[in-house]
Amino acid sequence: YSNFRKSVDSTGRRQYQVQNGPCSYTFLLPETDSCRSSSSPYMSNAVQRDAPLDYDDSVQRLQVLENILENNTQWLMKLENYIQDNMKKEMVEIQQNVVQNQTAVMIEIGTSLLNQTAAQTRKLTDVEAQVLNQTTRLELQLLQHSISTNKLEKQILDQTSEINKLQNKNSFLEQKVLDMEGKHSEQLQSMKEQKDELQVLVSKQSSVIDELEKKLVTATVNNSLLQKQQHDLMETVNSLLTMMSSPNSKSSVAIRKEEQTTFRDCAEIFKSGLTTSGIYTLTFPNSTEEIKAYCDMDVGGGGWTVIQHREDGSVDFQRTWKEYKEGFGSPLGEYWLGNEFVSQLTGQHRYVLKIQLKDWEGNEAHSLYDHFYLAGEESNYRIHLTGLTGTAGKISSISQPGSDFSTKDSDNDKCICKCSQMLSGGWWFDACGPSNLNGQYYPQKQNTNKFNGIKWYYWKGSGYSLKATTMMIRPADF
């Protein structure tokens, strides 16, 4: 028996099998779908990408296509030879051995083979066209790459020359820097030497200044006495001249006023002719007890006895009742004159009180009370003030009516708290009142939001701590 069968083998290739008696003829056709599926990066019939492929990818694709074309050509030639060689023999045998209808089968096979060949030829034509298309694209890309390469080479050359120029400049600058470093090192060494010399000089000057300050204090006191003596001598000379020129000089009695060598306040010193600001010795009223005070002979006509001064925080003002009573600190700097002396002084004559204030922003203000006095110790040195004028607030920052004086060890305020303990320093606290010029000294930038600082509420508010303060008194009739 004989039959004809068309099938697909396990690899997916098409095969034609002819069975004729004991002989079986199998024709394996080449794979016509040799182009991969569209998921492959090398698609045969897919639309070309906009972005050019890498040069290596293009070459690879071209090699694949050339290989496929060569394989197909070789296969066709083999097939042709095979048909020519083998079909002649087979045809003779068939003619001899099979009946007429086998001829029809062979014709069908031949037709099928011709059709396959024609199809294969068309495919090859397509492949050739694609290869040509791809080759053209690759040539264009290669041309573009070549142009780009030339441009890049030119740019690289330009950049190389720029780099060379920069390197030359850099070398020049490096040399300059090295030269400057050398000079700077020399200058620094010189400056260090100068600094050391200056430090030695400063320390020498500091000790000289200390000595001078001591001498100044002595000189000021001596100067005061000399001025007084000069004033007294002038008075004596004038008195003698008057007596000598008088027609009744023989009957005149030369009564010399007793020399005033003690002063109760700075106003008396000023009026005696001593008009230089400085430290003077004052005497308690009705007593021989003395106290040193700073006299301001410049502000508002002079004659001011300074009873309090703050300027730098060098003196601790959180003191006892006894210390505030007797006074503390240095009249040249920060100090409290003493409640007892001020009480006695202001209890005998009418005095005015001037308070000078400075803030940390360079502003100054003052408050002037036209009547000021302190009660005695039995009344806790209660303050009495009237007649406020000035620039440090229209309302008095010292509570009205006056409060008793309080210290850390003597609580006489009107608060269920201890104002002096809490707000620091001795003062005429109410509960605790709008001021405290004896509070904690806070330096600049630390002087705000501090309720225990140097406070004058009606000028700077509750939490502002002042830079400097001076309290001074003078007789109202000066």
Epitope: C417, M422, D430, A431, C432, G433, P434, Q446, F451, N452
Partner: antibody, heavy 122, light 112 residues
């Protein structure tokens, strides 16, 4: 003697208003910051509002902001709390309190009023 | 807001015995002026609160010296050296460093 005498409490419906007063005596009222503090039944203390001595600075608790208004009349030595849009959770004893220190130094409450009960209920 | 936490919430004490109440704040109450902004109040039954201790450790006038306050930063203590019958009530700590001022939950002191 320092005294703070309160008035104005009572029962009020939710959404309605009430005004509390606090009359001060025995000290310079115009020198002190004043506060309102409340205490819900069986609960702890809760700060409500503050006004400085001059009335220039005012603070409120978030829970009452926009509904309550604190004010003072230094000439009459009086402190006020206007309470609008009252809620059930505003039910409490309300105390007025004086700063311990004068001139707006916030260091605690030296004196307290006797308290006045505000009940918000329908 | 600063949170204040007291302990214990209830404190039964025998008269004559000491008592101690702790108060903790969620952040430091120490001001740059050196003071701790913490106060202690006592609210006796049926009365308004009264100030005992201000600024951490300062006893208010009229407060018996058996009461003392201590601590700094975030940890504070109120001590009663010898409890008396009149000391019963609720003790509150309060911070005044920041607005809003805030109170602890209260500690109820009762006599055994």
């Amino acid at each position: 003697e320092v005294q703070l005498v309160q008035s104005g409490g009572g029962v009020v419906q939710p959404g309605r208003s009430l005004r509390l007063s606090c009359a001060a005596s025995g000290f310079t009222f115009s020198s002190y910051g004043m506060h309102w503090v409340r205490q819900a039944p069986g609960k702890g203390l809760e700060w409500v509002s503050y006004i400085s001595s001059s009335g220039s600075t005012i603070y409120y608790a978030d829970s009452v902001k926009g509904r309550f208004t604190i004010s003072r009349d230094n000439a009459k030595n009086s402190l006020y709390l206007q309470m609008n849009s009252l809620r059930a959770e505003d039910t409490a004893v309300y105390y007025c309190a004086r700063d311990l220190l004068d001139y707006d130094i916030l260091t605690g409450y030296g004196y307290w009023g006797q308290g006045t009960l505000v009940t918000v209920s329908s | 807001d600063i949170v204040m936490t007291q302990s214990p919430l209830s404190l039964p004490v025998t008269p004559g015995e000491p008592a101690s109440i702790s108060c903790r704040s969620s952040q430091s109450l120490l001001h740059s002026n050196g003071y701790n902004y913490l106060d202690w109040y006592l609210q006796k039954p049926g009365q308004s609160p009264q100030l005992l201790i201000y600024l951490g450790s300062n006893r208010a006038s009229g407060v018996p010296d058996r009461f003392s306050g201590s601590g700094s930063g975030t940890d504070f203590t109120l001590k009663i050296s010898r409890v008396e019958a009149e000391d019963v009530g609720v003790y509150y700590c309060m911070q005044g460093l920041q607005t809003p001022p805030t109170f602890g939950q209260g500690t109820k002191l009762e006599i055994k």
